[in-house]
Interface confidence: low
């Protein structure tokens, strides 16, 4: 891999062992200034595998609010607007990083945590495994 | 909102002003032990709005590798396996938090950053604007 020289202006730290503790500035830099947050906001309703969004709140986590998608149907919506159970609505899941207060209730000490969230739903063809 | 009492065992810090700097333990705690990572791994291929996964690598970011979904078609795959352009494949996007090395190339100093990633694709009915 590429070795990037260490910046001499870095804060000093004993960074020899994992698990390691680092300094993180919580002033979020948003790279999405050019994106329209409403751009995909109605996909949940217009999809052939529509979903509802459920609020998941946890004050010990940063961000404290995460929205979870739950597929509305087992099947997918067909051209007639009916649910077709020959197809399946399934959640698209993604692992994301969050910060968990550790020790609990501490305002300035966190551990990185990986959680699985459902972002939306997609319509898939089922696979049948034929057992010999 | 609920006021949670501060844990007296918290590390000491001057936490008066934003932007604030916090301590983060990078030893990731994975909450997904019960999930099967392969469970949704083939949805990208079986979806009626299939997608390809592109590797996005940035050594100045943590995690350094993020996978981006790109929809394969403008339309959706119909029951005959053909692309139906009466429907649209669209990316499902999610804002996620990453850590950006700041100052650059520092191993132990980061700023929280919000980025928009495409997680997968879903098939939607197009909105047709009728011009009077």
């Amino acid at each position: 891999g590429i070795t990037i020289p260490r910046n001499p202006g870095c804060p000093n730290s004993e960074d020899k062992n994992f698990p390691r503790t680092v300094m993180v500035n919580l002033n979020i830099h948003n790279r999405n200034t050019n994106t329209n947050p409403k751009r995909s906001s109605d996909y949940y309703n217009r999809s052939t595998s529509p979903w509802n969004l459920h609020r998941n709140e946890d004050p010990e986590r940063y961000p404290s609010v995460i929205w979870e998608a739950k597929c509305r149907h087992l099947g997918c919506i067909n051209a007639d607007g009916n649910v077709d159970y020959h197809m399946n609505s399934v959640p698209i899941q993604q692992e994301i990083l969050v910060l968990r207060r550790e020790p609990p209730h501490c305002p300035n000490s966190f551990r990185l945590e990986k959680i699985l969230v459902s972002v939306g739903c997609t319509c898939v063809t089922p696979i049948v495994h034929h057992v010999a | 909102g609920i006021t949670i009492p501060r844990n007296p065992g918290c590390p000491n810090s001057e936490d008066k002003n934003f932007p604030r700097t916090v301590m983060v333990n990078l030893n990731i705690h994975n909450r997904n032990t019960n999930t099967n990572p392969k469970r949704s791994s083939d949805y990208y291929n079986r979806s009626t709005s299939p997608w390809n996964l592109h590797r996005n690598e940035d050594p100045e970011r943590y995690p350094s590798v993020i996978w981006e979904a790109k929809c394969r078609h403008l339309g959706c795959i119909n029951a005959d396996g053909n692309v139906d352009y009466h429907m649209n494949s669209v990316p499902i996007q999610q804002e996620i938090l990453v850590l950006r090395r700041e100052p650059p190339h520092c191993p132990n100093s980061f700023r929280l950053e919000k980025i928009l990633v495409s997680v997968g694709c879903t098939c939607v009915t197009p909105i047709v604007h009728h011009v009077a």
């Epitope: 597929c71 649910v83 159970y85 020959h86 399946n88 609505s89 399934v90 089922p126 495994h129 | -």
Partner: antibody, heavy 125, light 107 residues
Framework: EVQLVESGGGLVQPGGSLRLSCAAS????????MAWVRQAPGKGLEWVAT????????YYRDSVKGRFTISRDNAKNSLYLQMNSLRAEDTAVYYC??????????????????WGQGTLVTVSS | AIQLTQSPSSLSASVGDRVTITCRAD??????MHWYQQKPGKAPKLLIY???NSEIGVPDRFSGSGSGTDFRLTISSLQPEDFATYYC?????????FGQGTKVEIK
Amino acid sequence: EVQLVESGGGLVQPGGSLRLSCAASGFPFSTYAMAWVRQAPGKGLEWVATIRGSGESTYYRDSVKGRFTISRDNAKNSLYLQMNSLRAEDTAVYYCASPPQYYEGSIDRLWFAHWGQGTLVTVSS
Amino acid sequence: AIQLTQSPSSLSASVGDRVTITCRADESVRTLMHWYQQKPGKAPKLLIYLVSNSEIGVPDRFSGSGSGTDFRLTISSLQPEDFATYYCLQTYSYPFTFGQGTKVEIK
């Protein structure tokens, strides 16, 4: 080996309530959609309700909508059917049913490969 | 609701006979048709799933065929243990529906 054991059946008066339970073992319960199917004495099979693995989606036959509630406790590997405002026509053997394990279409497999022994619900005054 | 009509409602046959039971749906159920066997006082047993796939452990004298709206369960050579009631089930559309049953009796 998949095992489904129903309990909670019995005699109840019209308008009364009953809660059926189904204890499941031998498969990853939380991954699978589950169902209740009933059979009135001397009659055919009748699907009653289905619940998705996560519990987020439930489906009912019209005649029980608003009266019956299907639910699950994935931590306890248990399926439930809360039956309220019971009627004489609800008299039946109630079976808990689970899908096959070899079908990997999605999180949901929708036909019934495994059945419990059934529990009899009698609604009579 | 999709209605399934089985025929015949009952039949008498001898050991060794070839028996065919039909199930007709009043609209297409694609390939989401399944067949069950039930004996008195027992839970139903899955025989055939998705039109023509035999469940594990089911003797190969049982076979399924059909598509769309018309489906058949065939027992190529009836055995003493096959005397039972047979049901078709569609899981294409909620509410899921069963046929009214076909009782196979000894002649």
